[in-house]
Structures are given as C-alpha cells and as structure tokens.
Interface confidence: low
C-alpha cells in the first residue's frame, strides 16, 4: 500500500528539540523529493521544507531556516525533520508529503501534532453526561461524556469500542482559561434503548498514556 | 515570495449546484516555454490531510471525480465543482509550485447550503463525580441544525450569565449537512450549589421563538 506515516510529535518546551519521522512505503522512495508541510490549529497550510530524491539538496521556509534540518535515509525509506530551538508558533500538525518531482504534493501522511508549550502533560478527567427527561426529545435521548482538563491535544473518543458511530458528535476541543483543554462527545439514541443497551465512551489521551472507559447510564434517583 | 490569495473565504452552495473558487497569484506561475501553469488545488476534509485534486492548473489527479475541474492561466485560476455533493464539504487550497518557497492560498471553506433545520436542544447537569472534584460543568447540546448561526444564552435563577461559558461547533455533517453545537457553563461547586434553576436558551433561524431547556439542581 502506498502510504506515509509520521511519528515523533508531542509536547516540547520552548527552546527544546524534537525529531519527526515519516516512514514511506509502496513507492520507490529514492526517486522522489519529499516535503514537510505544517498546519497550525485552525489555520491553513504552510510549506516547511523539501529535500531532493538523493538528499543532496534541501530548501527551507524562512521561518524555520537555521533551526530545522530535513534529511532522509534511503535504506530505511524514511524522511526526518530535526526541529531545534522550538517556539510556540511552531505548534502545528506536521505532514509529510511526497513530491511529484514537479513541486506539487501527490501523497500525504495523516500528520503528527507538535505542541510547543511550557505547560505539563496532564491526563483528562472523564465525566458522564447522563440521559434524563431533560435530554430526551420525541423518542430520542442524548447522552455523552465530558472530557475535561487535559493537555496537550489530542484526545480520541469512541463509543462502545467503535461499534457505535451513528448519531455521534465529538466536538472540537476548547482551550479553557486554565490553559487546559476540554471537549464533549455526545450520541443520540432511541429512548427505548436506555434500559437495555450499555453505552460506554472510550477516551484515549496518548500524550499522558491515559485510557478511560466510562459507562454512561441514566441517573438513579 | 509568491503570495496566493483565494476568494471567497467561505462559500455555501446547494447540493447539485455549481461551486466556484478563485485563486490569484502575486506573479505569473506560467512558464511560457511549455505553456504550463505551476498551480495545484487540494481538498482537505475535516480531520484529514489534504488531497491533491488538480495539477498544472487543469489536470485532474487520477481517481478525482470529473465534477472537479480547474482553469485559468498566469495569475488567475478557478476551481469548479460542477455538481456539488455532500462529501465535497471541505477546505480547498490552491498552491503554486513555480518556485520555492512553495506557497498556499489561505483556503476556502465550502459548505452545503440546505434547508433550514431547527436544533434539538438537550441539557445535562454536572455529574456527581465532577462535583466531588470541586467544579461543575453544565452542558447544553444543540443537535443537527442549519444554518450554522445559533445563539445560546445561559440563565441561572433567571440571571443572564456571561464570561463563564464556552462553545464548540462540529464541522458540517457529510450526510445531512447539519451542524451541532455544545455550550458548557463552568462554575465552582460552591457557586453551583448557591442556585437552583439552570437554563439554556437557544435562538436559531429554524425556531419561531427561542427554546429553553432547564433543570432544577438536585432534582431528577
């Protein structure tokens, strides 16, 4: 399968260093120039660096010149980005992208998030949003999980280990005044299922190695 | 550096209708020697990496549906979607690859224009677990509405709240083209326990009058 898989992102303090990797498969790696492109949260695409197929030539955006080093290992089919003297404004999802050898990018990885902050990693607290008469409308009930006070992004939320996807809305995280993130994930289900069906939200915060499975049930009075 | 400017910043088009996005470069990206424009178009769906749609300004990448087409030359370019589908909800970027630094436009957010749908409104009290931690979050959910503009006001014992809530909105749903919104009112446990009635009032184009959902603290 033709694909690019980035790794190495995470939380780093201002002034610190991080090395990103991008494993390529399914094409002749040495024949193509490769690029790093980044995307700050909620912003557009920003080209970072390119390296020729042989690795002999590199180019950098002015914003990273002298701080970032792009390289490649043809034997490992891997692209690297060594990031030094990191700044808060380097916070972004970093994508690895294959060059068509004409300068457009015909294959992209899924990206790896780099967060540059002096804050510490913190795992979330997960609280149930319990269904009740106040969260029922015309035979449909809503329930959810509040994933609160974590850092850095991201967290992933699934329901019933991925078996429940219909009617699920996981909201974008908001940055609270405390500097910690919070998000909600909700699902609408038939009211009639509340007594019979089990609903569990599965929360994973990789930066803190936190995994929580929270059962959400009607509040017993 | 070559500056790429897209217009409009956002665009709402009905299903089956034509969508047009423009891109202007600060200098020509046409090589007259081979009459090729070094310009590409990318589609980025929510939570996904970008995907190449068009290169050489008008050549479709393999696997891209033929409803996508590119045109233009020199400094002015257009991406056209001839018959918009629900799955085309995305941000679209143009990119010049005439020279490094390669530069992208700021992006154009394309949404589906559909009929008005009023939100279903739900309210959730804080859990006992959370109250034990000393904080109370009250959540108001607005589900599956269109258009995106909605107003949520929190009232505590009928007193309007400000500065203590945060909202988050989903991207447009790729199936029914609606939005959902969560608004979270955050209080200390001590403040929460001083009051009885918690209400969120929702105003939306699809509602003939505001809808209020409320609960009394301590009651089921």
């Amino acid at each position: 399968e033709v694909q690019l898989v980035e790794s190495g992102g995470g939380l780093v303090q201002p002034g610190g260093s991080l090395r990103l990797s991008c494993a390529a498969s399914g094409f002749t790696f040495n024949n193509y120039a490769m690029n790093w492109v980044r995307q700050a949260p909620g912003k557009g695409l920003d080209w970072v660096s390119t390296i020729s197929g042989s690795g002999g030539t590199t180019n950098y955006a002015d914003s990273v010149k002298g701080r970032f080093i792009i390289s490649r290992d043809s034997s490992k089919h891997t692209l690297y980005l060594q990031m030094n003297s990191l700044r808060a404004e380097d916070t972004a999802v970093y994508y690895c992208a294959k060059d068509s050898n004409w300068g457009n990018f015909d294959l992209w990885g899924r990206g790896t998030l780099v967060t540059v902050s002096s804050a510490s990693t913190k795992g979330p607290s997960v609280f149930p949003l319990a269904p009740s008469s106040k969260s029922t409308s015309g035979g449909t009930a809503a329930l959810g999980c509040l994933v609160k006070d974590y850092f850095p992004e991201p967290v992933t939320v699934s329901w019933n280990s991925g078996a429940l996807t219909s009617g699920v809305h996981t909201f974008p995280a908001v940055l609270q005044s405390s500097g910690l993130y919070s998000l909600s994930s909700v699902v609408t289900v038939p009211s009639s299922s509340l007594g019979t069906q089990t609903y569990i939200c599965n929360v994973n915060h990789k930066p803190s190695n936190t995994k929580v499975d929270k059962k959400v049930e009607p509040k017993s009075c | 550096d070559i500056v790429m400017t897209q217009s409009p910043d956002s665009l709402a088009v009905s299903l089956g209708e034509r969508a047009t996005i423009n891109c202007k470069s600060s200098q020509s990206v046409l090589y007259r020697s081979n009459n090729r424009n070094f310009l590409g178009w990318y589609q980025q769906k929510p939570g996904q990496p970008p995907n190449l749609l068009i290169y050489w300004a008008s050549t479709r990448e393999s696997g891209v549906p033929d409803r996508f087409s590119g045109s233009g030359s020199g400094t002015d370019f257009t991406l056209t979607i001839s018959s918009l589908q629900a799955e085309d909800v995305a941000v679209y970027y143009c990119q010049q690859y005439y020279t490094t630094p390669y530069t992208f436009g700021q992006g154009t957010k394309l949404e589906i224009k559909r009929t008005v749908a009023a939100p279903s409104v739900f309210i959730f009290p804080p859990s006992d677990e959370q109250l034990k931690s000393g904080t109370a979050s009250v959540v108001c959910l607005l589900n599956n509405f269109y258009p995106r503009e909605a107003k949520v006001q929190w009232k505590v014992d009928n007193a309007l709240q400000s500065g203590n809530s945060q909202e988050s909105v989903t991207e447009q749903d790729s199936k029914d083209s609606t939005y959902s919104l969560s608004s979270t009112l955050t209080l200390s446990k001590a403040d929460y326990e001083k009051h009885k009635v918690y209400a969120c009032e929702v105003t939306h184009q699809g509602l003939s009058s505001p809808v209020t959902k409320s609960f009394n603290r301590g009651e089921c």
């Epitope: - | 020697s33 081979n34 090729r36 005439y98 490094t100």
Partner: nanobody, 121 residues
Framework: QVQLQESGGGLVQPGGSLRLSCAAS????????MSWFRQAPGKEREFVAV????????FYADSVQGRFTVSRDDAKNTVYLQMNSLKPEDTAVYYC??????????????WGQGTQVTVSS
C-alpha cells in the same frame, strides 16, 4: 523515474562543430537548471555550461565561452549544446544533468549516461 539521454556525439575534426542533445523524461525540465559537464580520460569531471530556467540566461566555463552555446526547448523537454570551433582538448565524454531544485543549487540528482566527443584529425 527521471532519465536523461544524451546523443549527438562522435568524431569531428579540429575547427568543426557538433550539436549534442539531452532528452529528459520523468520530470518537466522547465523549472530546473540543465547543465552540461565533461570528463576527459584520466581527468575529473568538469563543468561546461548551464541553461538556467527560461529567461534566466546561460553560463559557461571559461574554456568554452564564445565557442559553445547551450539552449533549451522546454516544450520538448530537451537541452542542447552547440559546440563550434572544436579543439582536441575538447575530447571527452559529455554528460547532462538536471539541477535537483528549482533554485540554482548546483546540486544534481540525476545524470545521463554520457556521449563521447572526439576531436581529432
């Protein structure tokens, strides 16, 4: 896969002319500088000429300035080296190469196999 294929070499008398061609495939050359190098027996490979991007001109080694002319036809994805007033010391294998970046980096990812030019009476 980028490939460069030289042609046009051969045996020519001193004072004569030859036109070398280098056809590129796998990459559109219009964005890239295209260069000619040569390597005489027992010597290091040396720079001869570069055709920069269209409109950006060409540069030559001192030893060939005024005698050799480099040109490019981006529509045909081909670069040429017109060699006039040839001398015995021009005898070498001539290689073309494509610059590895759109800027004029002087670093080359891809080379042709070479074509032999022999200047002799």
């Amino acid at each position: 896969q980028v490939q460069l294929q030289e042609s046009g070499g051969g045996l020519v008398q001193p004072g004569g002319s030859l036109r070398l061609s280098c056809a590129a495939s796998g990459r559109t050359i219009s964005r890239y500088a295209m260069s000619w190098f040569r390597q005489a027996p027992g010597k290091e490979r040396e720079f001869v000429a570069v055709a920069r991007r269209s409109g950006d001109g060409a540069f030559y080694a001192d030893s060939v300035q005024g005698r050799f002319t480099v040109s490019r036809d981006d529509a045909k994805n081909t670069v040429y080296l017109q060699m006039n007033s040839l001398k015995p010391e021009d005898t070498a294998v001539y290689y073309c190469a494509i610059d590895s970046d759109t800027f004029y980096s002087g670093s080359y990812d891809y080379w042709g196999q070479g074509t032999q030019v022999t200047v002799s009476s």
